[in-house]
């Protein structure tokens, strides 16, 4: 179920869940909000100060890197 994640526990969870994509501590500008003046929500606010489930954690994963040949 939902749990609070802080410090190393939060970084571990992000690293495992986001994997190769990496992650943000703040949602990218404009993510989930059309208002420029809306305060930026950070993962510490959402997952450390309040409980946080896996799906919310995934919202802080970075987008896929653009496909290019290795």
């Amino acid at each position: 179920g939902p749990e609070t994640l802080c410090g190393a526990e939060l970084v571990d969870a992000l690293q495992f869940v986001c994997g190769d994509r990496g992650f943000y501590f703040n949602k990218p500008t404009g993510y989930g909000s059309s208002s420029r003046r809306a305060p930026q929500t950070g993962i510490v606010d959402e997952c450390c100060f309040r409980s946080c489930d896996l799906r919310r954690l995934e919202m802080y994963c970075a987008p896929l890197k653009p496909a290019k040949s290795a």
């Epitope: 190393a8 495992f16 994997g19 994509r21």
Partner: antibody
């Protein structure tokens, strides 16, 4: 050198329980999250469960949720997998694994075989 | 979940010849990772980040690809390369592996 040694496997009847252990050495166990990965006989690899470095966060594959519990004792450098209500489809070699960022599933134990059969 | 499909399921190649294994993801991924599993042993990380060789891996192994299609190549098969090879995606939760490709000597 990273060493992971699993134990606790065996033959068990459907519906019964088993607890696997993984003794870790050669690295600072308490700094690393850990996972279990399993492999059914003659089949492929399947991630089973994750636990954060401090043990406060856990995730499970859907098929084991509510039946398996991953835990750890950082003072003993040991990882556990408590498996309840075992099913025939849980029959597999269970590996404990850990990762460095980008080096996913880089370190594996030798595995312990769990056979669920009546 | 992202489904990883490897082809072929098995492959017989003469010593010194090239072996090619393909892995297709059901959705685009950032990178592919490859593992080698010899009989009775745990898997071993072979290639990470699509094309980077893990420590101690001979340079006859190489990886390439992008998006949904990736390839592992053994340029000149040696007897010690007989194994099952698995691809892994870590771009989307949960981590998922391919079903494996068995490489044998012809």
């Amino acid at each position: 050198e990273v060493q992971l040694v699993e134990s606790g496997g065996g033959v068990v009847q459907p519906g019964r329980s088993l607890r696997l252990s993984c003794a870790a050495s050669g690295f600072t166990f308490s700094n690393y999250y850990m996972t279990w990965v399993r492999q059914a006989p003659g089949k492929g690899l399947e991630w089973v469960a994750y636990i954060s470095s401090g043990g406060g966060s856990t995730y499970y594959r859907d098929s084991v949720k509510g039946r398996f519990t991953i835990s750890r004792d950082n003072s003993k450098n040991t990882l556990y997998l408590q498996m309840n209500s075992l099913r025939a489809e849980d029959t597999a070699v269970y590996y404990c694994t850990t990762e460095d960022y980008g080096y996913w599933f880089a370190y594996w134990g030798q595995g312990t075989l769990v056979t669920v059969s009546s | 979940d992202i489904v990883m499909t490897q082809s072929p399921d098995s492959l017989a190649v003469s010593l010194g010849e090239r072996a090619t294994i393909n892995c297709r993801a059901s959705s685009s991924v950032s990178y592919m990772h490859w593992y080698q599993q010899k009989p009775g042993q745990p898997p071993k990380l072979l290639i990470y980040g699509t094309s980077k060789l893990a420590s101690g891996v001979p340079d006859r192994f190489s990886g390439s690809g992008s998006g949904t299609d990736f390839t592992l190549t053994i340029s000149s098969l040696q007897a010690e390369d007989v194994a099952v090879y698995y691809c892994l995606q870590r771009s989307s939760y949960p981590p998922t592996f391919g079903q494996g490709t068995k490489v044998e000597i012809k």
